[in-house]
Amino acid sequence: ITGISPITEYLASLSTYNDQSITFALEDESYEIYVEDLKKDEKKDKVLLSYYESQHPSNESGDGVDGKMLMVTLSPTKDFWLHANNKEHSVELHKCEKPLPDQAFFVLHNMHSNCVSFECKTDPGVFIGVKDNHLALIKVDSSENLCTENILFKLSET
């Protein structure tokens, strides 16, 4: 069960492991998401990250232990949130009202130095990643691949 209100919020720019910026552009009344190199003094787009505490049930391994996870939603502009489209393996911006659908929630991973990863709440093992200069959903098969650079992101206040 995910908490109704976030435990904290954080306004940050989002960049890839290789320091490319995630940008959002309004095109034909819908938002497009790009992964690109910005010019030296170009302003980075900011994203509002809302963090929710979530209890996750004991898993199939038989531990019988409940634990906590940190869920996050990402909103680059008012009333728009990043959504996982699992059918299309795509990441999209959707306008919606609260309560947000599960597709807007991502499990936060930050066990790789100071990078973060975003795992789909609706599809465990599938992460937001970079593919062909766009964000996409990427299936991560083995534990070793959790450190693969294309699913690692950096958060920065600047």
Epitope: T8, Y51, D63, V65, G67, M69, S113
Partner: antibody
Framework: QVQLVQSGAEVKKPGASVKVSCKAS????????MHWVRQAPGQGLEWMGE????????SYAQKFQGRVTMTRDTSTSTVYMELSSLRSEDTAVYYC???????????????WGRGTLVTVSS | DIQMTQSPSSVSASVGDRVTITCRTS??????LSWYQQKPGKAPKLLIY???SLQSGVPSRFSGSGSGTDFTLTISSLQPEDFATYYC?????????FGGGTKVEIK
Amino acid sequence: QVQLVQSGAEVKKPGASVKVSCKASGYTFISYGMHWVRQAPGQGLEWMGEINPHGGSTSYAQKFQGRVTMTRDTSTSTVYMELSSLRSEDTAVYYCARPSAAYSHYLGIDLWGRGTLVTVSS
Amino acid sequence: DIQMTQSPSSVSASVGDRVTITCRTSQGISSWLSWYQQKPGKAPKLLIYAASSLQSGVPSRFSGSGSGTDFTLTISSLQPEDFATYYCQQAHVLPLTFGGGTKVEIK
């Protein structure tokens, strides 16, 4: 029962190495990072580093870089911390510690081992 | 590395007193601050996480507040079992760093 069980106290000579073990039980081992924190007698807490049991990646505090090695054995749910080139200032209680949230250290550290006293003396 | 400045380093108080401990960070850490209690010979115990969230099982007399660089731990009515050392810790970035500690002693 969720717990971390650490190896026993060690006495080492300066220049030697020490390897402390920490066996986890009662939870999904690979879903939580494992941190090592030390505390010298009468002093505060000092973070040494973290290992991600999922893939084995590590992050070490600059102070210990080159002297510390953290490893894990997923088959036994055990994490190891080896500190080399010991000096008297390394005399401390060494704790393994698990964050309260899976996959993240943002929500603090809620599960601690009892600590292993390492004494470095000639 | 983010520096943590905790004050006071010690405080003498009586049972029933209100005790306030502050922690200042060298750069903004959003709300990613935790507070711990440690008694002699024991491991630290998590009291507060995300600046103001009370860890399960911790009495409600403990509360935390703040964001950015300035944070506070308050014990509203000190109990005999609260005499201990308290540490703040930032969880925003690695390396994780701790404050120097505040020893709460019996007056």
